[in-house]
């Protein structure tokens, strides 16, 4: 089909400009030279193309760069970034934080979590580690995006950078991510005094082991219930009633509200009922008085 492949002489494109918005898809495909498009990508986002037309331009770039776009093109994608799939982005090598900022601005408020996560991943790979400048950029332009990184990528965060992370940046982090970040935070804040240390370490406590939670219970920190509920189940279960009481301080009354929710429910099931009764909260479900507890897992390990 000649119409598909041949550009009419009067439609030949010598520069990327606003006249192109009047080209049909087929004319864009036939008349826009991919190398010219790549060289003048900085003009594209200022031109009021439809996304239908941007799809054609993307197709041209894909043909020119089957192994992935160079950063000179990526930096100027603008709204064309909304047409990129995670598979497209995985091919990129991005090192510039200006590129990251530009694309985070475009994607702000859109359902692009997979694309943004992949982009951030490529930046971390490109820069070699998750350095302070990258973390600062993420916290400024994409709160919560830190948690889109895999535990493997987060492991490249130097402890010195942890101080730049704000509590809200960790809101969407899962246990596996906090498992990686917590030891770094512990190291980063180790020279702080008790109360100051607790304020800093609190957002990371979802990755804390039992020993560290027990240690906190000796420091009069008065942990709030929200933080307690985010602790790892495995870290909470071995705590005694007395330790939980000291850990929560005046907030211990909140256990009643969370009685049916993990990890509180699971912790109650492991405590003696008469120990729970000492709290005076009416918590029910503990081990009845006079019952013997056999830990079969220990027996199996011995046999």
């Amino acid at each position: 089909d000649v119409e598909r492949t041949t550009c009419p002489p009067e439609k030949e494109v010598h520069e990327i400009d606003e006249s192109l918005i009047f080209y049909k898809k087929r004319e864009l495909e036939a008349c826009v030279d991919a190398a010219l498009l790549a060289a003048q990508m900085d003009r594209v986002d200022a031109i009021p193309f439809t996304y239908e037309q941007l799809d054609v331009l993307k197709h041209k770039l894909d043909e020119l760069y089957p192994q992935g776009y160079p950063e000179s093109v990526i930096r100027h994608l603008g709204h064309l970034f909304l047409k990129m799939s995670p598979e497209d982005i995985r091919k990129w090598n991005v090192t510039s934080l200006e590129t990251l900022k530009a694309l985070l601005k475009v994607s702000k408020g859109h359902e692009m979590s997979a694309q943004v996560a992949t982009l951030i991943d490529r930046v971390v790979v490109g820069r070699g580690q998750l350095d302070k400048d990258t973390v600062d950029t993420l916290t400024a332009f994409c709160p919560g995006c830190l948690c889109s990184l895999s535990p493997e990528r987060l492991s490249s965060v130097p402890p010195s950078v942890i101080g730049a992370v704000r509590p809200q940046d960790l809101d969407t982090c899962g246990p596996r991510q906090l498992d990686v970040l917590y030891p770094k935070a512990r190291l980063a804040f180790q020279n702080m005094s008790g109360s100051e240390y607790f304020v800093k370490i609190r957002p990371f406590l979802g990755g804390a082991p039992t020993e560290d939670v027990k240690a906190l219970s000796q420091q009069n920190v008065s942990m709030d219930l929200a933080t307690f509920m985010k602790l790892r189940r495995e870290a909470v279960l071995p705590l005694t009633v007395a330790e939980v009481q000291k850990l929560l301080g005046p907030h211990v009354e909140g256990l009643k509200v969370e009685e049916q929710h993990s990890p509180v429910r699971d912790w109650i099931l492991k405590q003696r009922q008469d120990d729970l009764d000492t709290l005076g909260l009416g918590l029910q479900g503990g081990i009845p008085n006079g019952y013997l507890i056999l830990d079969l897992s220990v027996r199996e390990a011995l046999s």
Partner: nanobody
Framework: QVQLVESGGGVVQPGGSLRLSCATS????????MGWFRQAPGKQRELVAR???????MYADSVKGRFTISRDNSKNTVYLQMNSLKPEDTAVYYC??????????WGQGTQVTVSS
């Protein structure tokens, strides 16, 4: 999602005029203003005129001097005044816009037929 409803199409003789309207069911947040497009049978859709968010207007060479795009923000309506119509202007006319999320929106279209 905001609905786009075109009206004003019809049959007109060469040299005649029509005024198309595009009413939106609410405020639109467009990346590229509002456009009037047309599609003739067997052809691809093409942009005829566009009015950007700042009021700037743009026209295809084939309609310059004959068509005028305008809008009334108080009525959430965009217009296309078409004068000196020619047989080659025969097509289904659509209004449309692109949001900030990666999607184009179109109305259902209104038929314009220029015939003697």
């Amino acid at each position: 999602q905001v609905q786009l409803v075109e009206s004003g199409g019809g049959v007109v003789q060469p040299g005649g005029s029509l005024r198309l309207s595009c009413a939106t069911s609410g405020t639109i947040f467009s990346r590229n203003g509002m456009g009037w497009f047309r599609q003739a049978p067997g052809k691809q859709r093409e942009l005829v005129a566009r009015i950007l968010n700042d009021g700037t207007t743009m026209y295809a060479d084939s309609v310059k001097g004959r068509f005028t795009i305008s809008r009334d923000n108080s009525k959430n309506t965009v217009y296309l005044q078409m004068n000196s119509l020619k047989p080659e202007d025969t097509a289904v006319y659509y209004c449309g816009y692109s949001d900030y999320r990666g999607t184009d929106y179109w109305g259902q279209g209104t038929q314009v037929t220029v015939s003697s």
